[in-house]
C-alpha cells in the first residue's frame, strides 16, 4: 500500500473507486454505476451522480415568482442514461419502455410516451431558482452578509464562478438563490449551474457528496443558517412541452 494510493482519492465525489492506474501511474477515479472516469478537481455531473446513487445499496415582495414554464423535479430518482461526457441523454426510458425528454439537469420536460418518442436535443436549463426556508432565528439575517456568504459558498465549495450567481433574495424566512448560465456564457472548465444546484441540494439534505468532508455548516456572521425546506425551480432555454391535461391537473 503506497503513499500514492493514500493520495488517490476523489475530493469532490465520494461515490467513486480510485486507483493509481491511470497514464504514467497517475490517479484515476471512476464513478460507481457507470464506471466512467471522473475529473476530481471539479463537480461530477448530476447524471453520473444519479446513476451512482441508483447503483448504491438502497438506504411588495422582493421574492421571485417562478415563471409559468418553471419545472420542479416531481419525478424524483431514476436510473438515467448518460452520454460519454456524463451529460443526460435527451431521451430517458425506464425498463417498461416508457420514455420522456429531459433537460440538462435531468428533469422531465415532456409527457411520458413510448419508444417512438423523439427528443431532438438536450435543452439547456439556463436559470435555476433555489427557494429555501430557514429555521426561526433571533432576528433576520443581514441581507448583504447573507448574499456574500452564499456567493462565497457557491464559489469555494461548489467551484461556481460568482458571475453565475445572478441574485440572492431574502424575505425572512425565505431565501432565494438565482443561478443563471446561458450556453454562450459557459466556458470549458466552468461548473454547470445544474451540478452546483444538485450538490447544494444534497448538502442541505445532509447527504454531502464530498469525500471525507464534514457536512455543510452554513453560518452568516457566526449565526447558523439552518434550512428546513428547499424547492428548486428549473427554467429551460426552450419552454417545456406538456399536454393541457397535465397543466390543468
Amino acid at each position: 500500500h503506497t503513499a500514492a494510493q493514500d493520495n488517490c482519492t476523489c475530493p469532490t465525489n465520494k461515490m467513486t473507486v480510485c486507483s493509481p492506474d491511470g497514464p504514467g501511474g497517475r490517479c484515476q477515479c471512476r464513478a460507481l454505476g457507470s464506471g466512467m472516469a471522473v475529473d476530481c478537481s471539479t463537480l461530477t455531473s448530476k447524471c453520473l451522480l444519479l446513476k451512482a446513487r441508483m447503483s448504491a445499496p438502497k438506504n411588495a415582495r422582493t421574492l421571485v415568482r417562478p415563471s409559468e414554464h418553471a419545472l420542479v423535479d416531481n419525478d424524483g430518482l431514476y436510473d438515467p442514461d448518460c452520454d460519454p461526457e456524463g451529460r443526460f441523454k435527451a431521451r430517458q426510458c425506464n425498463q417498461t419502455s416508457v420514455c420522456w425528454c429531459v433537460n440538462s439537469v435531468g428533469v422531465r420536460r415532456t409527457d411520458k410516451g413510448d419508444l417512438s418518442l423523439r427528443c431532438d436535443e438536450l435543452v439547456r436549463t439556463h436559470h435555476i431558482l433555489i427557494d429555501l426556508r430557514h429555521r426561526p432565528t433571533a432576528g433576520a439575517f443581514n441581507h448583504s452578509d447573507l448574499d456574500a456568504e452564499l456567493r462565497r459558498l457557491f464559489r469555494e465549495r461548489y467551484r461556481l464562478h460568482p458571475k453565475f450567481v445572478a441574485a440572492v433574495h431574502y424575505e425572512q424566512p425565505t431565501i432565494q438563490i438565482e443561478l443563471r448560465q446561458n450556453t454562450s456564457q459557459k466556458a470549458a472548465g466552468d461548473v454547470d449551474i445544474g451540478d452546483a444546484a444538485y450538490y447544494f441540494e444534497r448538502d442541505i439534505k445532509g447527504e454531502s457528496l464530498f469525500q471525507g468532508r464534514g457536512g455543510l455548516d452554513l453560518r452568516v456572521r457566526g449565526e447558523p443558517l439552518q434550512v428546513e425546506r428547499t424547492l428548486i425551480y428549473y427554467l429551460d432555454e426552450i419552454p417545456p412541452k406538456f399536454s393541457m391535461k397535465r397543466l390543468t391537473a
Epitope: 503506497t2 503513499a3 500514492a4 493520495n7 488517490c8 482519492t9 476523489c10 475530493p11 469532490t12 467513486t16 480510485c18 493509481p20 491511470g22 501511474g25 497517475r26 490517479c27 484515476q28 477515479c29 472516469a37 471522473v38 475529473d39 476530481c40 478537481s41 471539479t42 456574500a148 456567493r151 462565497r152 464559489r155 469555494e156 467551484r159 464562478h161 460568482p162 466556458a187 472548465g189 466552468d190
Partner: antibody
Framework: QQLEESGGGLVKPEGSLTLTCKGS????????WMWWVRQAPGKGLEWIA?????????TYYASWAKGRFTISSTSSTAVTLQATSLTAADTATYFC???????????????WGPGTLVTVSS | FEMTQTPSSVSEPVGGTVTIKCQAS??????LGWYQQKPGQPPKLLIY???TLASGVPSRFKGSGSGTEFTLTISDLEAADAATYYC????????????FGGGTEVVVK
C-alpha cells in the same frame, strides 16, 4: 519534499522549448494542483498555467499564455510546460510550484522549485 | 480582476514595523497568500487564508483582512526580513488573470 525544474537555457526567437518539473519525496498522483510561474529579470511573479494532478487533468491558463504554452502531466512524477513562438519578452526564470489544496480557487503555493532560467536571444 | 499592492518599496530601521497593503478588485473572501522572496531564491509562503501563519514562520509576521482589503504587517524588523513581498490569490484563476500583486521591496536600514 522538493521540486526541481529542468529544460531552461538559451533559445532563439520564434523557437520552442519544454520545461520539466520533477518532484522528489512525494508523488504527484495526489489531489492537488501544480503551477508554473515565471519572473522576468528584476520584475514580479506572473502565473502561466496550472494542472490538476489527481484524476482528471483539468488545466487553467493565463489569458496571454493560451495557445503558446501547454501544461501537461503524463506521469505521477513530472509536470511539463511546452512553450512555442518564444520572444525576448519570455526571458525569465520559470518556477514550478505545488498548490496546497485540491481547490484551484483557494490555492496557495507551499512548495517551490529553485527555478530554471530561460533566455530568448539570437 | 486585479491585485494592487502598495507601496512598491518601503524602508524601515531594524526593530521597526512595516505595513504592506494588497487590494483585490473583487471580493476574494479570505483567499489570500503572502510570500517572501529573496534575490536568487524562489518565493516562500508566509501566510495563507489571509491570516494563517505557514509552518515555521515567526509570529512577527501578521496577515489580516478579508473581502477586498488585506494587510501584511512585519513587526520587530530584522535584517533577514529584507526581501520582496508578494500577495497572491487564485480566486479568479478561471478568468485567466494573474493573481499576484506587483510586489513590495522591503529595505531594512
Amino acid at each position: 519534499q522538493q521540486l526541481e525544474e529542468s529544460g531552461g537555457g538559451l533559445v532563439k526567437p520564434e523557437g520552442s522549448l519544454t520545461l520539466t518539473c520533477k518532484g522528489s519525496g512525494f508523488d504527484f498522483s495526489g489531489t492537488y494542483w501544480m503551477w508554473w510561474v515565471r519572473q522576468a529579470p528584476g520584475k514580479g511573479l506572473e502565473w502561466i498555467a496550472s494542472i490538476y494532478v489527481g484524476s482528471g487533468s483539468s488545466t487553467y491558463y493565463a489569458s496571454w499564455a493560451k495557445g503558446r504554452f501547454t501544461i501537461s502531466s503524463t506521469s505521477s512524477t513530472a509536470v511539463t510546460l511546452q512553450a512555442t513562438s518564444l520572444t525576448a519578452a519570455d526571458t525569465a526564470t520559470y518556477f514550478c510550484a505545488r498548490g496546497a489544496t485540491n481547490n484551484v480557487f483557494m490555492n496557495y503555493f507551499n512548495l517551490w522549485g529553485p527555478g530554471t532560467l530561460v533566455t530568448v536571444s539570437s | 480582476f486585479e491585485m494592487t499592492q502598495t507601496p512598491s518599496s518601503v524602508s524601515e530601521p531594524v526593530g521597526g514595523t512595516v505595513t504592506i497593503k494588497c487590494q483585490a478588485s473583487e471580493d476574494i473572501s479570505s483567499n489570500l497568500g503572502w510570500y517572501q522572496q529573496k534575490p536568487g531564491q524562489p518565493p516562500k509562503l508566509l501566510i495563507y487564508g489571509a491570516s494563517t501563519l505557514a509552518s515555521g514562520v515567526p509570529s512577527r509576521f501578521k496577515g489580516s483582512g478579508s473581502g477586498t482589503e488585506f494587510t501584511l504587517t512585519i513587526s520587530d524588523l530584522e535584517a533577514a526580513d529584507a526581501a520582496t513581498y508578494y500577495c497572491q490569490t487564485s480566486y479568479y484563476i478561471d478568468d485567466g488573470v494573474n493573481g499576484f500583486g506587483g510586489g513590495t521591496e522591503v529595505v531594512v536600514k
